[in-house]
């Protein structure tokens, strides 16, 4: 693909017309070995064919080597996420080599030009890796390329062009525009490394998707569905908007992938788990909290290699900030109703009481609609570790006062004047913890008191471990 410089590496900066003093030959890609956590330390610049800097800067041939690859830039200066990532890698892997791939000259351009430059930058990285492979003890299997946004596709090209197979590529919200639906060799793909894991945090099905929506790795993780990230909403960044632009919201969601990865490096004791699922809606329904057959995995640095999988979509919920870990629960609730509940859906909340802590009042999100006389599955999550669940309280919020709901209530009353109250019967709730995979069944203390109406609450106590019921009879036989 066309690139705005000749073989000698001359660059024309498309955003800033070059001045006479700026047109001399210059390298387009630099490799900065970060020799210290200190961001003010200059580090060492490595170049193909020059072995001295490797010795001077104590490049460890037998250790892991990370290449961090930035994306498109409007500023021409490294953003703070890079400094955080360098520091986190040094903290976690003390002996590792951390190399920052500086391709600012080719990234600080119009987006379309930067995209066209990704291939040549990938080539430069591959050449560096090929040269390092000539050294004794250096193994390509120890190489981990970490690319953010456009940098993820650069990593893909590098993995594609290198002689041999790179150990791992992590794509941190790979860029979407000009890559969505692209041919496998023109974007990051599972073929580019032994293991390719991807975090998608800014995907949109409407409008411009800054991050790529399609799965491009062995495992593709979509935190919070891969779109709206907690802490990045308009309300959360109102401060930014008051003093800046909506750009801050975009940056927050796009960059969240980096911070999730940093979190996985520094908060080892709080690993986040993702669960395989066909789509975001099914995950929101709580259907996909299984760890059987490798259906769950750690996210970020701690992700387990799953080379047999390709484009495996995985989901999780997160907190709004570090540590991002939450605890996922699947609730299976059989709801029985005698009378027609009308078109309105019940607004239900659950509070979980555990041996370590109690949860807040958690909403049972209705993804489509509640099925009556059927088992409904819900996903709830807590920010703290509750420990073993002991009991739970289900509350039905009073009818939302919209004209539509009031009209429905009135209409229901006219059609059933003898039984105006809406009532659900819930005898038991089966709970599965995503993190521990433990299953527990909770029952109402008194089987005759298992009805709930708007404005009421119902308490459930642990009645057995697991889900298999000894008594196979219907839970509703006594209610008829």
């Amino acid at each position: 693909s066309p690139v705005p410089f000749g073989p000698e590496g001359r660059l024309e900066d498309k955003l800033h017309k070059p001045k006479a003093t700026q047109t001399e030959v210059k390298p387009s890609v630099r490799f900065n070995l970060r020799t210290s956590k200190d961001p003010e330390h200059e580090g060492c610049y490595l170049s193909v064919g020059h072995s001295q800097p490797l010795e001077d800067c104590s490049f460890n041939m037998t250790a892991k080597t990370f290449f961090i690859i930035h994306g498109w830039t409007m500023s021409g200066i490294f953003e703070n996420w890079l400094h955080k990532l360098v520091s986190a890698l040094h903290t976690r892997e003390k002996d590792a080599n951390v190399v920052v791939v500086d391709w600012l000259p080719l990234a600080h351009q119009l987006y379309t030009d930067a995209v066209n430059n990704t291939r040549v930058v990938g080539h430069s990285i591959a050449r560096m890796l090929d040269w390092l492979q000539e050294k004794d003890d250096f193994s390509l299997g120890n190489v981990h390329l970490i690319g953010y946004s456009l940098g993820a596709h650069v990593a893909g090209y590098a993995g594609n062009f290198v002689k041999g197979t790179v150990g791992r590529i992590t794509g941190l919200d790979p860029a979407g525009p000009m890559f969505e639906g692209a041919d496998i060799h023109k974007r990051l793909s599972p073929d580019d490394a032994d293991f390719v894991d991807v975090l998608h945090t800014y995907t949109r099905s409407f409008g411009l998707s800054i991050g790529i929506q399609m799965p491009v790795g062995h495992i593709d993780i979509y935190p919070n569905g891969g779109d709206f990230q907690p802490g990045c909403g308009l309300n959360d960044v109102l401060g930014s908007i008051a003093y800046g632009t909506i750009t801050e919201v975009v940056k927050c969601e796009h960059e969240r992938a980096v911070h999730l990865f940093v979190d996985s490096l520094v908060n080892q004791d709080k690993p986040s788990f993702a669960f395989q699922c066909t789509d975001s809606n099914r995950f929101k329904k709580g259907i996909c909290l299984s760890c059987r057959k490798n259906r769950c995995n750690n996210i970020g640095y701690n992700a387990k290699k799953m080379r047999k999988k390709r484009n495996s979509k995985m989901y999780l919920k997160t907190r709004a900030g570090m540590p991002f870990k939450v605890y996922h629960y699947q609730l299976k609730v059989h709801m029985f109703s005698y009378n027609n509940s009308g078109d309105t859906q019940p607004t239900l909340y659950i509070t979980l009481y555990g041996s370590n802590a109690d949860s807040q009042n958690l909403p049972l999100e209705i993804v489509e609609k509640i099925e009556l006389n059927a088992t409904n599955t819900f996903l709830v999550y807590t920010e703290e570790d509750l420990g073993d669940l002991l009991k739970m309280r289900l509350t039905w919020e009073g009818v939302a006062h919209s004209w539509y709901n009031l009209w429905n209530e009135f209409r229901n009353y006219l059609s059933q004047p003898s039984n105006p109250s809406r009532e659900l019967y819930i005898r038991r709730i089966r709970v599965k913890s995503g993190e521990t995979q433990r299953k527990v069944t909770f029952c109402t203390q008194d089987p005759t008191k298992s009805s709930i109406s708007p404005g009421q609450e119902l308490w459930f106590h642990k009645c057995q471990d697991g889900w298999k019921m000894k008594n196979k009879t219907s839970p509703f036989v006594n209610l008829a």
Partner: antibody, heavy 120, light 107 residues
Amino acid sequence: EVQLQQSGPELLKPGASVKISCKASGYTFTDNTIHWVKQSHGKSLEWIGHINPYYGGTNNNEKFKDKATLTVDKSSSTAYMELRSLTSEDSAIYYCARKGIYYSSPFDYWGQGTTLTVSS
Amino acid sequence: DIQMTQTTSSLSASLGDRVTISCRASQDINNYLNWYQQKPDGTVKLLISYTSKLHSGVPSRFSGSGSGTDYSLTISNLEREDFATYFCQQGNTLPFTFGSGTNLEIK
């Protein structure tokens, strides 16, 4: 020892242009960015913009994008800032400062400042 | 743009005193806060970076602290050369912005 040596004071008429220089020494010029800061009389500091000497890429504060043009001459390790269509509002002390490779990096070394007076 | 506010524009103190200069950001700046000293002759020097990291050659009587939106610079045992103007600056988001300055004068 890191040093940033700026050009001397300037007295100019409204409508004129001026080019202020900042010569760096004591470090590898292309390993850091050069930033320009304005201090109006008795006022605070305002960031004008920066240039990355490695490839000449610039980024200006929106407020100064039509006022200041930043360039470098790598052979002499010198950064330049040209201010055009001068008015009395441009009368100030202008500083060049060195900064590391990240947003968060501080301005760790400063030039002595160049006083610009615009008067008819 | 992120607004940096130094509410105290002027501060009087005596030699040997301990003084604290505060700085508030209009939004969370993730500890990317730097402090500078400007002498009457216009010379500007970096004192502290990343909220609390002392720049090389800066005396240990200078210290910095804070998080989120609120930050402060403390000089523990004032010496004659410390009487100057102090500026805070955020490095979280472009454009980089400075506080209005606090002038520390001798009592």
